[in-house]
Interface confidence: medium
């Protein structure tokens, strides 16, 4: 598999609608919860927790803060760690308990506590309960939660010092917790928590499972530096530990090494940076993506691999575990354990099977299926991804979130359009074409170019958002901006699923943001755009110049991944002629103008599509050089020299249908624009005064011109 | 004070339809799902529909779907349930229901209104 | 469906005693169990959530208990007032309610 391509398009901040929101003085807006039935977005920052407008984020409902005393900062401090920055309070858990409450945890200046916010008041209770294994002291330290029937699950550090990890339920009639035991969890570094529910019509009676994803120092692999490897472990909803043997811990918790690796290059990505459960009615076992870059990152590597669940659960129902065994110097090694394994199976949930054997809950379950769990809870067989390749990789970013919104074409076709967010604040949009991956567009959402810290997407039909959050504020974006799309042609070749060319209206439209019927929607997701009306006008700019000036002619051509050339008269412009430069790798530059260089200038654009070259016409350009004479000016008019040597521009209409390229142009290659020869010195005619259009009374003529095609597609 | 109060009693022949309604006062009634639950006349409880605060998901039991219509109208507090094809089976009182959930969908209920009885007979 | 199981429909205790109703269900259902009580000529009321959480304003004399597939709403020093039948629901799943038990004061 190559690596994917850069983005077709870039969008920068100011160029798309983006919302956002933030606070003076607030940071760290890492936690987000949504609300789609009340349209809610809850916001956990720093000492703080806000409710907006989810619809209009820049609109704030609510705000509560939660801040640190003097005396606890103080305390803090003395600890070694700094009053400014660690020492206040980092909201890490923002749960739902019901209508009108939310679970809250934050650091607390590294004593962690948690509270309800009641949201008709919004207002905390002020339970003050202790955080401590629900959220992490340090604010620098991992976490992970999820909250499933008024339990929360946590994985996160259990003490000041962070070296004591703990994935645990906290629970008022069974709360349980992992093994304070290298085999268990050895230095986790906690990604993502959540729960998937049984299947309604689940014939063996089984149990939900809350699924943990995180990157710990293997103990399988020894090395001379430390391995890290990916996990996915699991623990039963139903779970109430021991009766002896792991009295109040998990009996039911299992881990497994998660694979993602390119098999041809041996490319292994061992650092698990995000997980999302894609969850659709036409799926009958979710699905999860995880984000990866590899261990020693130098190049800026990411990879995404998807799993089906159905794929973990069977590592953990049917797989061989590993068990360590001693060598020499006492030195710990893990193997494939081959022996007996006792039964029920160890780790197993209670299902139907079992409770007919009598085993009702893990409080019955015999000693001897405890202990192997307790000493073998890492699982020799890998969970290994779908079609056993990543679904992306990319080079030059750090990815570092990502969210999956599963949506169908026009033509029926189902796509898993990935939103990646990366350490420079952008947002990249990919989806996999015939076992390609095309980046749809990278939208930059934070200006600052900062790391973006969580990323939600929303769901609700009609109104679909991605929430973006990072240190300085939120920005919510649209899954799609295809009314950017100006052209039926650039329409089809976004390749976008959620985009299609109107006709009618002449407008690229959201597929999905409309009730009204698809009919006469145009999409084409292999690119094809020879699917599009023919245009039979289209607009023109006329632009008259000076002898002996510079002309910029503009070409406004936003894909990344098409080549743009300028044709004069039909004929191709050359790169070499020093007559010629481009701006920004598209504007087209013509130097010492003259009455020869009048006529019609083209900007086309080349881009592969699979094995086809679309051309497209991005612009054209009725040029006219005018021998300016100096005019009579009156004592007290001001004088001023115009850039450029421009008189005036005016639009025309006229056809826009391409004529085919021959041969190579002045053209953007990717290495940038060419080098431009030097200014020519201004000339007597280049002082104009700004009364010049009356000098040209020809210009106020209005003709409209229309240029014949010469399309031979 | 939470209050949901459903319209009066009435009694349908088999194959006739009924609009009930419930008026809900004392909370913000466009923050919760809202769901209807009959008991029949040997007092069994039984969940008959669900919608979620916004309207934008629809539940039923298995019974009553594609005879019954389950609506919201927040700006008017009221929710609503359109009873047609009415049979026997269906004589019981049905209460309004609000689900506390923060998701909706939880399924639980934590204030009923007093009840509408609904007798189907010929 | 998930079939929720009252195995007793009556119940007899004297004011002071302590009462103890189960509740069976078909599968595992965790933690996600409800308890009403309906007093005669009244609409049910939320008495337990989540198997154990009191609902506002119940008194602590009724206590949920249980996980899985089997649970207990429990009763501590019966009053009078406590007179009404007792439901147990469901909601892993579309909502399914026990047949409930009646508690009479001897």
């Known amino acids: 598999m190559a690596f994917a391509p850069i983005p077709r398009i870039t969008w920068e901040h100011r160029e798309v609608h983006l919302v956002q929101f933030h606070e003076p003085d607030i940071y760290n807006y890492s936690a987000l919860l949504l609300s789609e039935d009340k349209d809610t977005l809850y916001i956990g920052a720093r000492e703080a927790v806000f409710a907006v407008n989810a619809l209009n984020i820049s609109e704030k409902q609510h705000e509560v803060y939660w801040k640190v005393s003097e005396d606890k900062k103080a305390k803090c401090a003395e600890k070694g760690k700094s009053k400014q920055t660690e020492c206040l309070n980092y909201i890490r858990v923002l749960q739902p308990l019901s209508a009108t409450s939310l679970y809250v945890c934050g650091t607390n200046a590294f004593q962690p506590a948690c509270d309800h916010l009641n949201l008709t008041s919004f207002k905390f209770l002020g339970k003050n309960e202790d955080g401590k294994g629900r959220c992490p002291f340090d604010p620098a330290h991992s976490y992970t939660s999820v909250m499933v029937d008024g339990e929360l699950y946590s994985g996160t550090s259990y003490n000041f010092l962070g070296s004591e990890p703990i994935i645990s339920r906290n629970s008022s009639h069974s709360p349980l917790r992992t093994e304070y035991a290298i085999p268990w969890l050895n230095e986790p570094s906690f990604v993502f928590a959540d729960v998937i529910r049984k299947s309604p019509d689940s014939p063996d009676g089984e149990d939900d499972r809350v699924y943990f994803f995180f990157t710990e120092v293997s103990v399988e692999y020894e090395f001379v530096f430390r391995v890290l490897i990916p996990r996915i472990a699991r623990v039963c909803k139903g779970d109430q530990g021991g009766l002896r043997t792991l009295q109040k811990k998990w009996t039911s918790f299992l881990k497994a090494r998660l694979i993602c690796s390119r098999p041809d290059s041996g490319l292994v990505f061992n650092v698990l940076r995000d997980v999302f459960v894609l969850r659709s009615p036409g799926l009958k076992v979710p699905v999860f993506y995880a984000l990866f870059t590899p261990q020693l990152n130098n190049v800026g590597l990411s990879a995404v691999c998807a799993y089906n669940l159905s794929t973990a659960e069977e590592v953990f129902s049917h797989g061989k575990y590993m068990q360590s065994t001693t060598v020499e110097q006492s030195h710990t090694k893990w193997v494939r354990y081959n022996g007996p394994v006792p039964k029920p199976r160890p780790g197993a949930c209670i299902d139907s099977e079992a409770r007919a054997a009598n085993y009702t809950s893990s409080l019955n379950l015999p000693d001897k299926t405890l202990q192997f769990v307790k000493d073998h809870p890492l699982m020799d067989d890998s969970v290994t991804p779908i079609d056993n390749r990543p679904r992306l990789i990319k080079k030059d970013v750090n990815y570092t979130q990502i969210v999956v919104d599963r949506t169908q074409a026009l033509d029926g076709t189902v796509y898993d359009v990935m939103f990646v967010s990366t350490d420079r604040g952008a947002l990249h949009k990919a989806i996999s074409l015939e076992h390609a991956v095309h980046i749809i567009e990278e939208t930059q959402l934070f200006q600052d170019f900062e790391p973006v810290q969580t990323l939600l997407l929303s769901s609700k039909k009609g109104n679909r958002f991605v929430y973006a959050g990072s240190n300085s504020g939120v920005v919510q974006a649209p899954l799609a901006f295809c009314g950017k799309h100006g052209t039926c042609e650039d329409c089809v070749l976004a390749r976008d699923p959620y985009c299609a060319w109107s006709p009618p209206t002449a407008t690229c439209v959201a597929l999905h943001q409309t009730e009204s019927p698809s009919r006469g929607l145009i999409q084409e997701m292999s690119g094809d755009a020879s699917v599009c009306p023919d245009k039979s006008k289209g607009s023109y700019r006329q632009h008259f110049f000076k002898h002996g000036g510079t002309a910029e002619l503009k070409c406004s051509q936003k894909s990344n991944l098409a080549r743009v050339f300028w044709k004069f008269q039909n004929g191709v412009l050359k790169a070499e002629s020093p007559k010629y430069g481009l701006m920004g790798r598209k504007n087209l530059l013509i130097f010492n103008l003259s009455e020869g260089d009048s006529g019609v200038y083209q900007c086309l654009s080349e881009e592969r599509v699979k094995n086809k070259t679309v051309f497209q016409v991005v612009a054209k350009h009725v040029l006219e050089v005018k021998v300016v004479p100096k005019p009579v000016v009156a004592p007290t008019l001001s004088v001023v020299q115009t850039e450029g040597s421009r008189i005036a521009t005016k639009v025309l209409v006229a056809s826009t249908q391409g004529s085919s390229p021959p041969t190579p142009a002045v053209q953007a290659t990717s290495s940038g624009a060419i080098t431009l020869p030097p200014k020519p010195a201004p000339t007597g005619t280049s002082c104009e005064p700004k009364i010049v259009i009356n000098t040209v009374p020809q210009l106020h003529s209005e003709k409209t011109m229309y240029l014949k095609s010469s399309d031979n597609r | 004070d939470v209050k949901l109060v459903e319209s009066g009693e009435d009694l349908v022949k088999p194959g006739g339809s009924l609009k009930v309604s419930c008026a809900a006062s004392g909370f913000t009634f466009r923050d919760y799902a809202m769901s209807w639950v009959r008991q029949t006349p040997e007092k069994r409880l039984e969940w008959v529909a669900y919608i979620s605060s916004g309207g934008d998901y629809i539940y039923y039991a298995d019974s009553v779907k594609g005879r019954f219509t389950i609506s919201r109208d927040n700006a008017r507090n009221t929710l609503y349930l359109q009873m047609t094809s009415l049979r026997s089976e269906d004589t019981a009182m049905y209460f309004c229901?609000?689900?506390?959930?923060?998701?909706?969908?939880?399924?639980?209920?934590?204030?009923w209104g007093q009840g509408t009885s609904l007798t189907v007979s010929s | 469906d998930i079939v929720m199981t009252q195995s007793h429909k009556f119940m007899s205790a004297s004011v002071g005693d302590r009462v103890s109703i189960t509740c069976k269900a078909s599968q595992d259902v965790g933690a996600t169990v409800a308890w009403y009580q309906q007093k005669p000529g009244q609409s049910p009321k939320l008495l337990i959530y989540w198997a154990s959480t009191r609902h506002t304003g119940v008194p602590d004399r009724f206590t949920g208990s249980g996980s899985g597939t089997d649970f207990t709403l429990t009763i501590n020093n019966v009053q009078s007032e406590d007179l009404a039948d007792y439901f147990c629901q469901q909601y892993s799943n579309y909502p399914t309610f026990g047949g409930g038990t009646k508690l009479e004061i001897k």
């Open positions: 229901t609000r689900d506390p959930s923060f998701y909706g969908r939880g399924y639980y209920f934590d204030y």
